[in-house]
């Protein structure tokens, strides 16, 4: 007996589609072996029509696919545009058609119900709009027009040209009679309900000379689209509900165990707290379509999601909806990375951001999630070097360690930096991840002077003190610019014996600028790292002034946190619209910061440290 299981009998009608789900024991071998759908011929051979390796027969081209869900031990065969010729005996199976594990499926495609001659068929999703066309002859132009619904042997009046409207259709139906010369009237029914399904009769005039036309209205519940995403990754629900509801409030909800639908997010400002920090509702296009992005996917996010439109911002019968069934794959290609990173006021954090390693050339971004209204995520930094003005001197995006991970360093932390941040690229949108920064009690581990004023032409020495736990880490100084932080050349770091007992007096790494030039003004970072993995950093601003003359005043350099607040949509801002979430900027407002000058160059800058070991462990 084969352990593969599925539906023995599948029946459908011409023009429709089927979604055949086959179940298999999810052993490691089964999960990764070939899956197939084949048709049994008279000879007994089973000819492959579609397989998990990408094969699609010419007969199925453009209308069928096979999707494997390895974690659930299922695969789904979708076949659209069915015809009577598709009726027959099939197998869904694993391995090789002739001797693999398989299950027999019988597919029967029928013509559909017998309808009166000349019946027009209208197939529409629930909540949408249908326009029924009713032709008539010239002699019936002045006569009463009407639409009836056939219920059994009786006909129930739905609407007529004498202003009658059946109560079941109140406020959602209208009969339009065109100007002279056009021999057709139309009946428009909005916000279709399942109960509207059935056979209708258009009538113009009365008696034996009347015009009649049959219309078969099929109202369908929308098929949920199967969406299969990786744990920790991101999903985008694209919702296009039509122009009719372009100006109506939109929502995304999740169907619960009571079969009601809990709002996840809507355009009226409601948001489920379970999605805090990891959801955005994209601004609507002119056609009323919108999309919702959820990052940091969890197993408990699985379920049936509906998007829709209604003035209350929640699901109501008879309004258009779209449906998805979300599966979250625990065998994720997205590596684990901390979802919470903690830092202390005045200290720093180094955030590791995963990206699709096949897209090493993609642009990398980091944005700050803001929950107001539908959510937005203004970009703070990108790999091309643009940094928001108020983060000048304290934020950098590094390509290291590479191979699927980049690093974002934020220092000079304040309590205002607490919040949710998104890592993203201009490539694979499923690799968007969320990290929460929390500011906790404590002191920074690296100590540098608050502000330093250097004198032109003289020598400047800036100390950076570090605790014993960093004695084996690599220490560095770098000069910050909005394109990164350029490491300054190191000098001989002295004898290692001084660090065997972690001598109190020897725990410092110094930066020397000799001689000081105008180009040396700017932000400098002292940091620790292990290989390509960055730990803590501390920032110091160096102001450069002329030699003091009697009566001159000391000018304190601008501190990073004194930068002006971000202004929304002022002259220096460009509003970036996110078209179908292809643009990773996520409707950010960003400011472009001018480069902060040349890097400190050559032998003028040197780093001196009495440490010679590199430390293991993490500074986070």
């Amino acid at each position: 007996k084969s352990p593969v299981f599925g539906p023995q009998e599948v029946s459908s009608v011409e023009g429709n589609s089927v979604s055949i789900k086959c179940y298999y024991p999810p052993t490691s071998v089964n999960r990764h072996t070939r899956k197939y759908w084949c048709r049994k011929g008279a000879s007994g051979r089973c000819i492959t029509l579609v397989s998990s390796e990408g094969y699609v027969s010419s007969n199925y081209a453009g209308r069928a696919n096979l999707t494997n869900f390895p974690e659930n031990g299922t695969f789904v065969v979708n076949i659209a545009q069915l015809s009577r010729d598709d009726s027959g005996h099939y197998k869904c199976g694993l391995g090789i058609n002739s001797r693999g594990l398989s299950f027999d499926v019988s597919l029967e495609v029928s013509q559909g119900p017998e309808l009166p001659n000349g019946t027009e068929v209208y197939t529409v999703d629930v909540g949408r709009t249908v326009t029924i066309k009713c032709p008539f002859k010239t002699e019936n132009a002045p006569k009463t027009k009407a639409l009836y619904k056939k219920i059994g042997q009786t006909s129930v009046l739905v609407i007529d040209s004498r202003n009658y409207v059946n109560p079941n259709y109140k406020d959602r139906i209208r009969l339009r009679i065109p100007g002279t010369g056009q021999l057709i009237f139309t009946v428009v029914i909005d916000r279709l309900r399942l109960s509207d399904h059935g056979l209708y009769l258009c009538q113009a005039g009365d008696g034996s000379n009347r015009d009649e036309k049959n219309a078969d209205l099929q109202v369908l519940e929308p098929e949920p689209e199967l969406v299969y995403e990786d744990l920790r990754g991101s999903v985008t629900f694209h919702c296009a509900l039509g122009l009719e509801v372009a100006n109506v409030a939109k929502f995304l909800c999740r169907v619960n165990s009571r079969e009601t639908c809990d709002v996840v997010i809507n355009t009226l400002g409601k948001r489920d707290s379970a999605f805090e920090g990891r959801i955005l509702l994209n601004p609507q296009d002119k056609d009323g379509s919108f999309s919702v992005v959820i990052t940091g996917l969890r197993k408990e996010d699985e379920g049936r999601y509906l998007c829709g439109a209604h003035s209350d911002g929640q699901l109501q019968e008879g309004w258009p909806i779209q449906a998805w069934q979300l599966f979250v794959n625990e065998e994720s290609t997205i590596p684990r990375s901390p979802t919470v990173v903690k830092g202390v006021a005045g200290g720093s954090v180094a955030v590791l951001c995963p990206y699709n390693p096949k897209e090493s050339q993609s642009l990398k971004y980091w944005c700050l999630w803001e929950g107001a209204q539908n959510g937005r995520c203004p970009l703070l930094v990108e790999s091309q070097g643009l940094v928001q003005e108020q983060y000048e001197g304290r934020l950098s995006l590094l390509q290291e360690p590479g191979n699927g991970t980049f690093t974002v360093i934020l220092n000079q932390l304040t309590t205002q930096d607490a919040g949710f941040y998104w890592c993203l690229t201009n490539g694979d949108t499923r690799w968007r991840t969320t990290v929460e920064i929390k500011i906790i009690e404590g002191e920074p581990n690296l100590k540098v002077p608050g502000n330093v004023t250097a004198v032109l032409g003289e020598t400047l020495n800036i100390p950076c003190h570090f605790p014993c736990k960093f004695s084996s880490y690599e220490k560095y100084w770098c000069k910050w610019s909005n394109t990164g932080c350029q490491t300054l050349p190191s000098q001989d770091e002295g004898p290692s014996e001084a660090f065997v007992n972690c001598d109190e007096n020897s725990r410092l790494v110094s930066l020397t600028l000799n001689p000081v030039t105008r180009a040396d003004e700017g932000w400098y970072w002292c940091g620790v790292k292990q290989g390509h993995f960055y730990g803590e950093t501390a920032a110091v601003y160096v102001a450069v002034e002329e030699k003091k003359v009697a009566g001159s005043r000391y000018v304190s350099p601008a501190k990073a946190d004194a930068a002006p607040d971000e202004k929304v949509l002022d002259s220096g801002v460009r509003e970036i619209e996110n078209k179908a979430i292809q643009d990773p900027r996520l409707f950010a407002e960003e400011k472009v910061v001018a480069d902060t000058g040349d890097q400190a160059g050559g032998s003028r800058a040197s780093v001196d440290s009495s440490s010679s070991e590199e430390q293991g462990g993490s500074s986070k």
Epitope: F5, P7, V13, Y23, T74, L194, E221
Partner: nanobody
Framework: EVQLVESGGGVVQAEDSLRLSCAAS????????MGWFRQAPGKEREFVAA??????????YYADSVKGRFTVSGDNAKKTLDLQMKDLKPEDTAVYYC??????????????????WGQGTQVTVSS
Amino acid sequence: EVQLVESGGGVVQAEDSLRLSCAASGLPFSSSRMGWFRQAPGKEREFVAAIGWSGRSTYKYYADSVKGRFTVSGDNAKKTLDLQMKDLKPEDTAVYYCAAHPDYYGDPRTSGAYRYWGQGTQVTVSS
């Protein structure tokens, strides 16, 4: 409140036929899957047959032990389910339960794939 009510159970002779019916009320959505399970004395509840609806397509599932003898049918709009049983055997003796679920995900053979259950109807097949 959701209610599934089975009917049609009884005592029959081996090789006879019997038709079970199930009527659902209070289901908030039109159900997308309904199924039959059975439980014989001292045994675990086992899958018998199921029917799923999606759009204008219907999917029927059967346990190997009843394939060719039992036929499942139903009406999604009316929320009814039937099980036509032919060529009954003494080993078919059990309490038959009707089950329903609003969507059609999850293996239809597992009881966890259903949210609502009836009280059951007894079928006894004597030799």
